[in-house]
Interface confidence: low
């Protein structure tokens, strides 16, 4: 008599999470009499997946009617597959007895579950940095299977190369996670720039998934300061302007000092945006020359985004000015830079 064969034709089956998996098994002979059972894994710790005779297996159904006479097809269908169902499934023939005796096992079918990666989440640095500094962005995506995946970083359409990527865990798992860090060198023009993390995987049958971060959250563009004087007015008042240009973010406090004493403090708000995303702001101070005997040292002090103050000073020469009305002599700009931190 020819030896019984248990045939599992597929070495492996790959199924998308949520779909059904069909595991095929046929036997070459109806004898000896005895049941077929399905297990996941081999050895003493194997897990019973399906037993026609007894037990409750709500997600497992036989493909053909196993009670039919002369049935030699013991294929099963497992519904609503999840990554936890991955593993090698064995179709095992038993000889009828008390108890039934294991006679022959199929070669096994490895079920791999294709699970989509989650949408990539990109996070940037906790604190802002200025141009020419390097900042790191992190991208994470979870829950995918199989392990093979690729991740690319872009800044304004250009692929970044200073990237470090890890897929965890290193060994076999029902699903995997990817974490990647990209280092980006900032420029003053990056307020409108964007970094994109792009993840592609077998389960993504079209475009890869993308996560984005705006460099506006990571960059600080320090201001340029310039203090200038308009010509003296007829009422002996000098109009001095402090121009604060090309800064980002908008959070900025400006203080005027007259001979070291605080004259006025202003906060920037609702400023129009430059094309490159930065802001400009101009503040004026009227100085009554006739109220001063000596030269007046004016200082425009700017605190930007919580950084140390930047000062620009300017001396108005009052000793040379006659006190009568109509004097129109220009003041002298000493342009002293008390502290200029960029």
């Amino acid at each position: 008599e020819e030896e019984l064969q248990v045939i599992q034709p597929e070495k492996s089956v790959s199924v998308a999470a949520g779909d059904s998996a069909t595991l095929n098994c046929t036997v070459s002979s109806l004898i000896p009499v005895g049941p077929i059972q399905w297990f996941r894994g081999a050895g003493p710790g194997r897990e019973l997946i399906y037993n026609l005779k007894e037990g409750h297996f709500p997600r497992v159904t036989p493909v053909s009617d196993p009670t039919k006479r002369n049935n030699m097809d013991f294929s099963i269908r497992i519904s609503n597959i999840t990554p936890a169902d991955a593993g090698t499934y064995y179709c095992v023939k038993f000889r009828k007895g008390s108890p039934d005796v294991e006679l022959k096992s199929g070669a096994g079918t490895e079920l791999s579950v294709r699970a989509k990666p989650s949408a990539p989440v990109v996070s940037g640095p906790a604190v802002r940095a200025t141009a020419e500094h390097t900042v790191s962005f992190t991208c994470e995506s979870h829950g995918f299977s199989p392990r093979d995946i690729t991740l690319k970083w872009f800044k304004n359409g250009n692929e970044l190369s200073d990237v470090q990527t890890n897929v965890d865990p290193a060994g076999k798992s029902v699903s995997y996670s990817i974490r990647s860090t990209a280092r980006v060198v900032l420029t003053r023009r990056d307020v409108h720039s964007q970094v994109i993390c792009e993840v592609a995987h077998v389960t993504l049958q079209g475009d890869p998934l993308r996560g984005t971060a705006n460099l506006s959250e990571a960059i600080r563009v320090p201001p340029f300061l310039e203090v200038t004087q308009q010509s003296m007015r007829a009422d002996n008042q000098v109009n001095v302007t402090c121009q604060v240009t090309k800064f980002y973010p908008q959070r900025l406090q400006l203080t005027w000092l007259e001979n070291g004493n605080v004259s006025r403090t202003e906060m920037a708000s609702a400023l129009p945006e430059n094309k490159d995303g930065t802001y400009n702001w101009t503040s004026w101070l009227l100085v009554n020359v006739s109220a001063h005997r000596d030269d007046v040292k004016l200082t425009c002090q700017v605190e930007h985004d919580g950084q140390p103050a930047v000062n620009k000073s300017f001396s108005v020469k009052v000793s040379a000015h006659p006190k009568e009305q109509g004097s129109n002599t220009a003041a002298e700009n000493t342009g002293t830079n008390e502290r200029n931190i960029y």
């Epitope: 093979d148 995946i149 690729t150 359409g157 592609a200 995987h201 077998v202 993504l204 049958q205 079209g206």
Partner: antibody, heavy 123, light 107 residues
């Protein structure tokens, strides 16, 4: 580095068949789909279809069903294009081209191209 | 099938010129559009995918824009090595289709 190396030029008689190979180097063949593109002399590019290198399943464009067969031999990291019952109008350069997306098997944009194989059909 | 129409079919320009090639799809292809460069007797070279993304190693003078049905490839300052034929390709819908090509020649 990544490269697709195709077999050399072929001169065939009408009615014969030809098999063009495309060997993948620098990456795993089964990780990226492989497309085939035809360029007749002096003409533009024409997409013939692609093979899902993960499952081996081919997809053919409308004009390339029947005489054209895409296949794989993963043991030698090679994709093949076989054309049967050759006609004079099959004279063209045939390119293999890798789909850009990792495991992106729906055709897509191509990131790497083979150098091309000229197939000439003449009696 | 989606028809891809490039204009102009040919173009003469000088080194240093700014050149724009347009590609129009007969129906919406989203951003599933790629650009390729081909020199005589050579295989095509991949320049741009997803309408705007340059492949690594592609000079920054090449840029892509557009979505839906209208796309452009711009070369900001032509270099001697840029004289070639350029093809657009949509990969939104089967069959994947190419434009007829734009031949960029030296003036």
């Amino acid at each position: 580095q990544i490269q697709l190396v195709q077999s050399g030029s072929e001169l065939k008689k009408p009615g014969a068949s030809v098999k063009v190979s495309c060997r993948a180097g620098g990456y795993t063949l089964t990780d990226y789909a492989m497309n085939w593109v035809r360029q007749a002399p002096g003409q533009g590019l024409e997409w013939m279809g692609f093979i899902n290198t993960y499952t081996g399943e081919p997809t053919y464009a409308q004009g390339f069903k029947g005489r054209f067969v895409f296949s794989l031999d993963t043991s030698v990291s090679t994709a093949y294009l076989q054309i049967g019952s050759l006609k004079a109008e099959d004279t063209a350069v045939y390119y293999c081209a890798r789909t850009r997306g990792y495991y992106d098997f729906d055709g897509g944009a191509f990131d790497y191209w083979g150098q091309g194989t000229l197939v000439t059909v003449s009696s | 099938d989606i028809q891809m129409t490039q204009s102009p079919s040919s173009l003469s320009a000088s080194v240093g010129d700014r050149v724009t090639i347009t590609c129009r799809a007969s129906q919406n292809v989203g951003t599933h559009l790629a650009w390729y460069q081909q020199k005589p007797g050579k295989a095509p070279k991949s320049l741009i995918y997803s309408a705007i993304y340059r492949y690594i190693g592609v000079p920054s003078r090449f840029s892509g824009s557009g979505s839906g049905t209208d796309f452009t490839l711009t070369i900001s300052s032509l270099q001697p090595e840029d004289f070639a034929t350029y093809y657009c390709q949509q990969y939104n819908t089967y069959p994947l289709t190419f434009g007829q090509g734009t031949k960029l020649e030296i003036k």
